[in-house]
Interface confidence: low
């Protein structure tokens, strides 16, 4: 069964800067990745970035740098201040659309005990939805 993992990390140098990493553990080819915060996309979440393997990347503030790390994982840097700034308990979600598995989504947030600059290793997060 395919799985999605999500890792959230706060940067030590900039307390309002977060790095989100997501990966897809499956054999299918990825056609789209959607990163959102505040909940799953389509369920109250707000889209931060959309990554298409061939046609590029679209991102919205406070997302600053979205990129592919591997063919099945992505990373996203967020920088914000004031209302647009993420906070320690913000939930980030990644949805991977793949063929032939369909869509798989998981969410994660900063581990409660995290010091800035530290984070738990990327482990599969609970799968919230499989279309």
């Amino acid at each position: 069964t395919p799985e999605v993992w999500v890792q959230v990390r706060m940067e030590a140098t900039e307390l309002s800067s977060f790095t989100i990493r997501c990966g897809f553990l499956g054999s299918g080819s990825i056609s789209l990745v959607t990163v959102s915060w505040g909940g799953p996309n389509g369920a109250g979440g707000t889209t931060l970035a959309v990554l298409h393997p061939e046609r590029g990347i679209r991102q919205w503030a406070p997302a600053r740098q979205a990129r592919w790390e591997t063919q099945s994982s992505i990373s996203l840097i967020l920088e914000g201040s004031g209302a647009s700034s993420p906070c320690a308990n913000t939930t980030f979600c990644c949805k991977f659309a793949s063929f032939p598995e369909g869509s798989w989504e998981a969410c994660g947030s900063l581990p409660p005990s995290s010091d800035p600059g530290l984070s738990a290793p990327p482990t599969p997060a609970p799968i919230l939805r499989a279309d």
Epitope: S31, L32, T34, N41, G42, T47, V50, H52, R55, G56, I57, R58, W60, A61, K95, A97, S103, D131
Partner: antibody, heavy 119, light 106 residues
Framework: QVHLHQSGPELVKPGASVKISCKAS????????INWVKQRPGQGLEWIGW????????YYNEKFKGRATLTVDKSSSTAYMLLNSLTSEDSAVYFC????????????WGQGTTLTVSS | DIQMTQSPSSLSASLGGKVTITCKAS??????IAWYQHKPGKSPRLLIH???TLQAGIPSRFSGSGSGRDYSFSISNLEPEDSATYYC????????FGGGTKLEIK
Amino acid sequence: QVHLHQSGPELVKPGASVKISCKASGYTFTAYYINWVKQRPGQGLEWIGWIFPGSDSTYYNEKFKGRATLTVDKSSSTAYMLLNSLTSEDSAVYFCARDGELRGPFDYWGQGTTLTVSS
Amino acid sequence: DIQMTQSPSSLSASLGGKVTITCKASQDINKYIAWYQHKPGKSPRLLIHYTSTLQAGIPSRFSGSGSGRDYSFSISNLEPEDSATYYCLQYDNLLTFGGGTKLEIK
């Protein structure tokens, strides 16, 4: 050849809802964003939101959040926009338009659907 | 949200002449601007994207330039069929249209 064909004109009463369709042909429907754009009589163009048929991901202009709902039917390559709680301010021509590239503007447009809200 | 201030709102020009329309963004839009021609009862037509790239089939008398927050669009050798409303669209962060410029050819 890429073509977006929209449903016909609508005359509805205030407070009602309307669903406008946009049928795509000539390309892979699930690979490109469909956007919706509003134009009130004598006014400019206003972006409502987009939907990516490949994953059903949506994004709305804050102004239209809660008023517009974008959906797709992949089996018929059709995008839909539902507008609810209509007022006279919603009387306009609504266009669907396809993104040319992920970071690109709209390259193909539907012919427009005229919505008239009147009692 | 990024705001796009387009000017002028209307202008009149002579056949064979040249016009320039400007759009100013409320922040840097990294050259992600497109220009459209819109005629009454028709669908908007994409002329230029990424500041200066002509869409396929668009004649070279249409041109665009700019960077940062300031962008311009020009039409030279004006023809009668250029009478239309022209819009800029920023697509760097979400999407925002300018207010439009109505062009009349005398």
